[in-house]
């Protein structure tokens, strides 16, 4: 039975050229996290964090994606094309799969303020 919930940073905005942290947190379960996958809006896999074998970043994103903090992901040198949905998928044992959604808006404006809050999708 899946008792856990995924909390995410929800809808966030950040400046073009800046960086942003995508964060998901799994709570209310004792399940063991075996792997976390981070996907972009077009179903492309950005990164994997495997419990035994560590972080793997897709080579095309290596210069702009940094692992962490924790099981989160840091996107750097943001472009307007980075706007869109991001998904964290937590594979756990024995619960199964949990999935969270974050929407990132990259703003052209130099006065854009980074906004982030944790919410349950």
């Amino acid at each position: 039975m899946m008792t856990g919930t995924i909390e995410t940073t929800g809808n966030i905005s950040a400046k073009k050229g800046g960086s942003v942290i995508l964060q998901c947190h799994l709570s209310s379960t004792m399940a063991q996290v075996t792997q976390v996958n981070w996907e972009q809006h077009d179903h492309s896999l950005l990164a994997i964090r495997n419990a035994e074998l560590g972080w793997h970043i897709y080579p095309a994103f290596k210069d702009r994606v940094a692992p962490g903090p924790g099981l989160g992901l840091t996107l750097q040198s943001l472009t307007m094309n980075d706007t869109g949905e991001y998904f964290c998928t937590y594979h756990t044992y024995p619960d199964g799969t949990y999935r969270g959604r974050i929407f990132l808006e990259v703003l052209e404006s130099s006065v854009a303020e980074h906004s982030a809050r944790f919410q349950i999708p």
Partner: antibody, heavy 117, light 106 residues
Amino acid sequence: EVQLVQSGAEVKKPGASVKVSCKASGYTFTEYSIYWVRQAPGQRLEIIGRIDPKNGRTYYVDKFKNRATLTADTSASTAYMELSSLRSEDTAVYYCTRIYGFYFDFWGQGTLVTVSS
Amino acid sequence: DIQLTQSPSFLSASVGDRVTITCKGSQNVNKYLVWYQQKPGKAPKLLIYNTDNLQSGIPSRFSGSGSGTEYTLTISSLQPEDFATYFCYQYNNGFTFGQGTKVEIK
């Protein structure tokens, strides 16, 4: 052209150790992690662990945590896998392979390790 | 981790045959599936990545398809050099391999 060339076959006695080498060429050795994978007769491939040559950081599957040691010599573009306390069930072909993001794109030719008394 | 089961384990075929190999996951593989070819004493060769992307230099007679838990590798017209063992690999949950399918000459 990317190539991974492994050392030759080994025959070892139970309780001994074996060290297999994997020389990389055709790419920047420190840019990609090297995985070690083995295939015992009639069995599927199983992962032993991973080394990042850039910083020497290693990761091991639980099953091999206490017996496998992965190292890399960046000056020689060579990765090594040492397995200790060998037993008959360690008889297998051992492969080094480069991981491209999430999947393995180039493999060594394999090294047969036979454990027999 | 996801367990992968290939079928059949052995396959006898003739040159020119259309050959299909199946790889089934114990859970959703989410299209993160890869196919390799291996000949005796040789290094495995990457054929297809992410379900249906042909690796550079691989002949177009090889193709991949599938979704969810079920994936297939198809060789449209088997050539003499295609007699080999084929195995699948997934990275959606853990990094695991299928047991292999040996394609033999009929």
